[in-house]
């Protein structure tokens, strides 16, 4: 058993049929010695008396808020949560496996630049009695500070019969060094509590591996005289690290017909302009990627050819 | 050519070669995300690799103030990786494919290090750790880790030379 926060405790349970329960001794936080009784949750029935209560925790029915009283007055509370371990593996019932980029990916994180700011998100089908708490650091043995905000519900989607809820959190490395080569990964830890179930999820990454630039901005077409060719120009996204001479991007320019089956023409360039042939009803799209490190491409920025 | 002790490197040449290094490093190990190498325990492996750290002056401001600290750090790293790529980690079993970019990568590391330090000038270089994995699978894993680490290193080096070529070239 360990303390998650004041008066909230997590009991770690081996979850198999013939596992013995965990013996837990609750102590009433009071100088009083006599006349103390214990209750659980909303029930007024006395579960035991005395300054300590010894219980066996084996089921969610044994978890909950234990309260000690004296003469009708509440002395203290202890909320017990359960953390299940099945076949040596901690349960992951609360969050959905996003399966990208690999199985057992519960947390996904992205950064728009090298400033040390990043966003993580996760999915669940649970709509109520759910809380999240996020901590992060650079490295684990001698951790350096990363500050995370509160997790918030950022999207709701309907998937078949189920509703899916997306939560996200923003974090910022306290003393980021954008130009340095990272040697210690960022660690992100999410505590999830659903009713009386506790779970924790972690992700470990280098900022460089989660970079995904915003799409190029101000995408414009300039027709070239007496030609089907156009000059496409664009700018670095505002959110990208500066100076651009140091934090450079490379770009992919694509000409795509109306039909998805039509052949796509693609050009790769380090410049912020390119000359392409604009077909009728086609559109021109541009996306960006770090020039020197193959992290994710940005989403496409698009303009119609007409 | 770079002359240790103050004069500028051939920024543009260094830029071109470092960008080529980036391309080669990724073609040698393109499996980004397929294998989370940090899960495999990095203890003795890449901890001794020279990283370009915050105080090494490789940021735009540091380069403007005095690029020598940064160039020395890059040079150290290039020599380190050049030795690793020439070691039995890469020459031993399982043999690399004949068209593997590792050979080109090795040569380009050497080329860039020589651009930064012509014969007769010596910056101190870092000792390379004695990594002699016994099993072929250990060697394979070590190659992946070294290449992943190299990708990060050459990315920073390429940024340095690109910025230098754009802002510090005479």
């Amino acid at each position: 058993i360990w303390e998650l926060k004041k008066d909230v405790y997590v009991v770690e349970l081996d979850w198999y049929p013939d596992a013995p329960g965990e013996m837990v001794v609750l102590t009433c936080d009071t100088p009083e010695e006599d006349g103390i009784t214990w209750t659980l949750d909303q029930s007024s029935e006395v579960l035991g008396s005395g300054k300590t209560l010894t219980i066996q925790v084996k089921e969610f029915g044994d978890a909950g808020q234990y309260t000690c009283h004296k003469g009708g007055e509440v002395l203290s509370h202890s909320l017990l949560l359960l953390h299940k371990k099945e076949d040596g593996i901690w349960s992951t019932d609360i969050l959905k496996d996003q399966k990208e980029p690999k199985n057992k990916t519960f947390l996904r994180c992205e950064a728009k630049n090298y400033s040390g700011r990043f966003t993580c998100w996760w999915l669940t089908t649970i709509s109520t009695d759910l809380t999240f708490s996020v901590k992060s650091s650079r490295g684990s043995s001698d951790p350096q500070g990363v500050t995370c905000g509160a997790a918030t519900l950022s999207a709701e989607r309907v998937r078949g019969d189920n509703k899916e809820y997306e939560y996200s959190v923003e974090c910022q490395e306290d003393s980021a060094c954008p130009a340095a080569e990272e040697s210690l990964p960022i660690e992100v830890m999410v505590d999830a509590v659903h009713k009386l179930k506790y779970e924790n999820y972690t992700s470990s990454f280098f900022i460089r591996d989660i970079i995904k630039p915003d799409p190029p901005k101000n995408l414009q077409l300039k027709p070239l005289k007496n030609s089907r060719q156009v000059e496409v120009s664009w700018e670095y996204p505002d959110t990208w690290s500066t100076p651009h001479s140091y934090f450079s991007l490379t770009f992919c320019v694509q000409v795509q017909g109306k039909s998805k089956r039509e052949k796509k023409d693609r050009v790769f360039t380090d410049k912020t302009s390119a000359t392409v042939i604009c077909r009728k009803n086609a559109s021109i799209s541009v996306r960006a990627q770090d020039r020197y490190y193959s992290s994710s491409w940005s989403e496409w920025a698009s303009v119609p050819c007409s | 050519r770079a002359v240790p002790g103050g004069s500028s490197p051939a920024w543009t040449q260094c830029q071109q070669l470092s960008q080529k290094l980036c391309t080669l490093a990724w073609s040698a190990h393109p499996l980004v995300g397929h294998m989370d190498l940090r899960e495999e325990g990095d203890e003795e492996t890449t901890n001794d690799v020279p990283h370009i750290q915050c105080g090494d002056g490789c940021d735009p401001q540091g380069l403007r103030d005095n690029s020598q600290f940064c160039l020395q750090r890059i040079h150290q790293g290039l020599i380190f990786y050049e030795k690793l790529l020439g070691s039995d980690i890469f020459t031993g079993e399982p043999s690399l494919l004949p068209d593997s970019p590792v050979g080109q990568l090795h040569a380009s590391l050497l080329g860039l290090s020589q651009l930064l330090q012509p014969e007769g000038h010596h910056w101190e270089t870092q000792q390379i750790p004695s990594l002699s994995p016994s099993q072929p699978w250990q060697r394979l894993l070590l190659r992946f880790k070294i290449l992943r680490s190299l990708q990060a290193f050459v990315a920073v080096a390429a940024r340095v030379f690109a910025h230098g070529a754009a802002t510090l070239s005479p």
Epitope: G21, I55, Q56, V57, G61, D62 | -
Partner: antibody, heavy 119, light 107 residues
Framework: EVQLVQSGAEVKKPGESLKISCQSS????????IGWVRQMPGQGLEWIGI????????RYNPMFRGQVTMSVDKSSSTAYLQWSSLKASDTAMYYC????????????WGQGTMVTVSS | EIVLTQSPATLSASPGERATISCRAS??????LAWYQQKPGQAPRSLIY???NLQSGIPARFSGSGSGTDFTLTISSLEPEDFAVYYC?????????FGQGTRLEIK
């Protein structure tokens, strides 16, 4: 006052289905799991299983798994034990009981339902 | 599953006497053992939980002791209403199991 009131005695033929009930009152129904115990004529007590009234989480004795089904209706504070196809060997007294949280034993018992299966 | 063996199977005693019933587990159950009393035609009634804790409303002449594999229920001075069948139950490991019962009869 805590009370567990069970449905009346049943006489059934082999192969028939049956659902017996246990209604709780006098306490917070969702705080306490409900269990079932079998007592064959002239025999001792056998633990069938327990069930959460909150989310229908169930722990069956392997000996009874597939033979009986436990269920609960939170809105009426009632637990059920049912059979889809009775056998003569199911003849017994069935008790529902309230599981004490933080312990696991049964602190209050229903009066029992006698089930007789005979052709 | 854990097997609980009660002894004796039948105990004859007189009112006012001390009665002791033993319950032995095939493997350790810690202190997670309960005792029940059942009278003919009635449901069992909880007497003792966690090996030695008296259930609310149960007379103080009933007491329990033991831990691990050996447990004892003691009735310090028998009253006429105490003659019944007594069961021990372990609730440490699923499936929870009961002893076969001890019949306490008037001598």
């Amino acid at each position: 006052e805590v009370q567990l009131v069970q449905s009346g005695a049943e006489v059934k033929k082999p192969g028939e289905s049956l659902k017996i009930s246990c209604q709780s009152s006098g306490y917070s129904f969702t705080t306490y799991w409900i269990g079932w115990v079998r007592q064959m004529p002239g025999q001792g007590l056998e633990w069938i299983g327990i069930m959460s009234p909150v989310d229908s989480d169930i722990r069956y004795n392997p000996m009874f798994r597939g033979q009986v089904t436990m269920s609960v209706d939170k809105s009426s504070s009632t637990a059920y034990l049912q059979w889809s196809s009775l056998k003569a060997s199911d003849t017994a007294m069935y008790y529902c009981a309230r599981r004490r949280p933080g312990q696991g034993y049964f602190d209050f018992w229903g009066q029992g339902t006698m089930v007789t299966v005979s052709s | 599953e854990i097997v609980l063996t009660q002894s004796p199977a039948t105990l004859s005693a007189s009112p006012g006497e001390r009665a002791t019933i033993s319950c032995r587990a095939s493997q350790s159950v810690g202190s997670w053992l309960a005792w029940y009393q059942q009278k003919p035609g009635q449901a069992p009634r909880s007497l003792i939980y966690a090996a030695s804790n008296l259930q609310s409303g149960i007379p103080a002449r009933f007491s329990g002791s033991g831990s691990g594999t050996d447990f004892t229920l003691t009735i310090s001075s028998l009253e006429p209403e105490d003659f019944a069948v007594y069961y021990c139950q372990q609730y440490n490991i699923y499936p929870y199991t009961f002893g076969q019962g001890t019949r306490l009869e008037i001598k």
